[in-house]
């Protein structure tokens, strides 16, 4: 009886794993083995595919074959018993185009209100992604184990920290990789769960802001308690993209080591041009806080995106705010030749309830105010360019009293 050649051959490539699956053509014939040959583009001869010779099952692995993943190859299969079937040729394919990104490795660290996620490619030193290692981005889905309500976080790199979590709570997450340059989306990792710790005695510093004064950077933050010492560290932002390397060499800012105030001043020449991450930690001598949220600090933007200067004209039920160019030292206005959007925050002096207005115009009306009431206003500028999504620090607050009633005309 003539052997039929196998059919429906599927090539599955995940990272550097090359798997072939096929269907037997004739289930009734026992003790059949299968063998594959392969042919590279521009070659006439067929070569035996190592790892896929005389296979008794309907699956084989040819990962050991050192292929050029960007070069098209063709496969053929036949069944063998006493005699052999005719060859069945599989459509030619390019491994890189066919490859899927496998599940990444995930490593979690817990704090009281944060989780640090370290992500590595699933295959270390992968041949398939050798030219794309730095192009991987990741996305994750995270949920509280108790609720199951999912939150998605897109476009993260090999180190990501999620803040504002609840203490003593189990969070679960899964991560997948993407190579946007090749339109490839990977397979999710297994689910990883971790419980945040009991609440720390000392909270981390908050609201870190960098501003420029003369030739110095001024770093300010808020802290709950007095009589603390603080230290500030920096890291090159691009290091968060480094795949597989999870040793982050945070550096101390010398003028910001063991400072006793909630600000520190250091010369601009501490940093060369670039994008950095900054973080602050508090200590009372016995206990240490966890690190603050990391803020991104771009020396290029910081140098020119200064807080706006504004004047207020007070009416009985509103303020008219006129925004002008920020001043450099020496009182000369800074020319900012890129479009800005202004965020104006105002509040009643006796209350903490803030209201916000976002405006492109440089003259803004703050409506619905009460007469003879002191309101405070602060403002900051944001760049409108998508790629240059940066913000200035807030200006100092200016407080004014509204006029008596009936002066709104």
């Amino acid at each position: 009886k003539n052997l039929k050649s196998p059919q429906k051959v599927e090539v599955d490539i995940i990272d550097d794993n090359f798997i072939l699956r096929w269907n037997r053509s004739d289930e009734s014939v026992g003790n059949v083995t299968f063998s594959f040959d392969y042919q590279k583009t521009g070659m006439d001869n067929w070569i035996k595919l190592s790892g896929c010779q005389n296979i008794t099952s309907t699956k084989c692995n040819f990962s050991s074959l050192k292929l050029n993943v960007y070069e098209e190859i063709k496969l053929r299969i036949r069944a063998e018993k006493e005699n052999t079937s005719s060859w069945y040729e599989v459509d030619s394919f390019t491994p890189f185009r066919k490859a899927q990104i496998g599940p990444p490795e995930v490593h979690l660290e817990a704090e009281d209100k944060a989780i640090v996620i370290h992500i590595s490619p699933g295959t270390k030193d992968s041949v398939m992604w050798a030219l794309d290692g730095l192009s991987f981005t990741y996305s994750l889905v995270i949920w509280k184990n108790s609720s199951g309500v999912e939150e998605r976080i897109e476009n993260i790199y090999s180190r990501h920290k999620i803040y504002k979590l609840s203490p003593e709570t189990t969070y679960c997450l899964k991560v997948k990789a993407a190579l946007l340059t090749s339109w490839k989306i990977g397979v999710y990792s297994p689910v990883h769960c971790i419980k945040t710790t009991v609440e720390n005695e000392l909270p981390p510093p908050e609201n870190i802001e960098v501003s420029v004064q003369n030739q110095n950077y001024v770093l300010k933050w808020d802290y709950t308690y007095a009589n603390m010492t603080f230290q500030v560290q920096w890291l090159h932002a691009f290091l968060k993209r480094n795949p597989g390397n999870h040793l982050y060499k945070w550096k101390q800012i010398p003028d910001c080591e063991n400072v006793k105030t909630t600000q520190c001043v250091f010369p601009q020449n501490v940093f060369q041009k670039g994008i950095y991450l900054l973080r602050v930690q508090a200590s009372d001598g016995n206990n240490t806080s966890f690190w603050s949220e990391e803020i991104k600090f771009d020396t290029e933007i910081q140098a020119f995106l200064l807080p706006p200067v504004f004047n207020i004209r007070s009416l009985s039920d509103s303020f008219h705010i006129y925004i002008g160019a920020p001043k450099q030292s020496g009182n000369t206005p800074v020319i900012q030749d890129y479009p800005l959007i202004y965020e104006i925050i105002f509040w009643e002096n006796t209350s903490n309830a803030e209201r916000k207005i976002i405006e492109k115009k440089t003259d803004v009306t703050v409506p619905n105010l009460k007469p003879l009431t002191v309101y405070c206003v602060k403002a900051r500028a944001h760049t409108m360019d998508e790629k240059l999504n940066k913000s200035s620090v807030f200006s100092d607050a200016v407080c004014e009293k509204t006029k008596p009633g009936n002066t709104s005309k």
Epitope: H107, L108, E109, A110, E111, D112, H118, I194, T197, V198, N200, E201, N245, H246, L247, K249, K251, Q252, Q281, N286, N287, T288, F290
Partner: antibody, heavy 118, light 107 residues
């Protein structure tokens, strides 16, 4: 294969100083931290300090500030621990260790025994 | 400095048994804790990092757990080659302090 090869045992007199070495193979020390740890006989481990060989930045445990100086020579892939004004309290085994991913000490040298005696 | 306390200096166990070595931090260190094994006359060997992750090549009978201030190294199905001293260490902040060690004796 990652290895940290430490210099041989030392016998020195009180008041003298000594320089211990730790030569790495299988990795580039610039990509890691190198730590030094002290262990006295039948006692626990004490962290002395560490160096970032990439830029020479060092950190020391307060107890070893002024006693220990850590340096590195990236051309020979070697880190050094210099101990000064030695006393019998400095008699111990000194280990170098690699600070790897997530800051943990993933590989250790075989240790150098230092004896301070007159 | 953060103090790491291993309250049991010695522990005795039988081959095949399960034993838990504990370690307490003087303040919350998250999950930034490692465990090391030191056999007599040898240098320490890394077993566990980030409280619960096993280094490659470490047998899966070694398990780390805990977070915040309380950490445990569990050895299930103890083998004679596990006779050693076990140290915990915090890597949350400088200095990288170690526990005093727990010596495991095999009966």
């Amino acid at each position: 294969e990652v290895q940290l090869q430490q210099s041989g045992a030392e016998l020195v007199k009180p008041g003298a100083s000594v320089k211990l070495s730790c030569t790495a193979s299988g990795f580039n020390i610039k990509d890691y931290y190198i730590h030094w740890v002290k262990q006295r006989t039948e006692q626990g481990l004490e962290w002395i300090g560490r160096i970032d060989p990439e830029d020479g930045e060092t950190k020391y445990a307060p107890k070893f500030q002024g006693k220990a100086t850590i340096t590195a020579d990236t051309s020979s892939n070697t880190a050094y621990l210099h101990l000064s004004s030695l006393t019998s309290e400095d008699t111990a085994v000194y280990y170098c260790s690699r600070g790897g991913n997530f800051y943990y000490f993933d590989y250790w040298g075989q240790g150098t025994s230092l004896t301070v005696s007159s | 400095d953060i103090v790491m306390t291993q309250s049991q200096k010695f522990m005795s166990t039988l081959v095949g048994d399960r034993v838990s070595v504990t370690c307490k931090a003087s303040q919350n260190v998250g999950t930034n804790v490692a465990w090391y094994q030191q056999k007599p006359g040898q240098s320490p060997k890394a077993l566990i990092y980030s409280a619960s992750y096993r280094y490659s090549g470490v047998p899966d009978r070694f398990t780390g757990s805990g977070s915040g201030t309380d950490f445990t190294l569990t050895i299930s199905n103890v083998q004679s080659e596990d006779l050693a001293e076990y140290f915990c260490q915090q890597c949350n902040s400088y200095s990288y302090t170690f526990g005093g060690g727990t010596k495991l004796e095999i009966k």
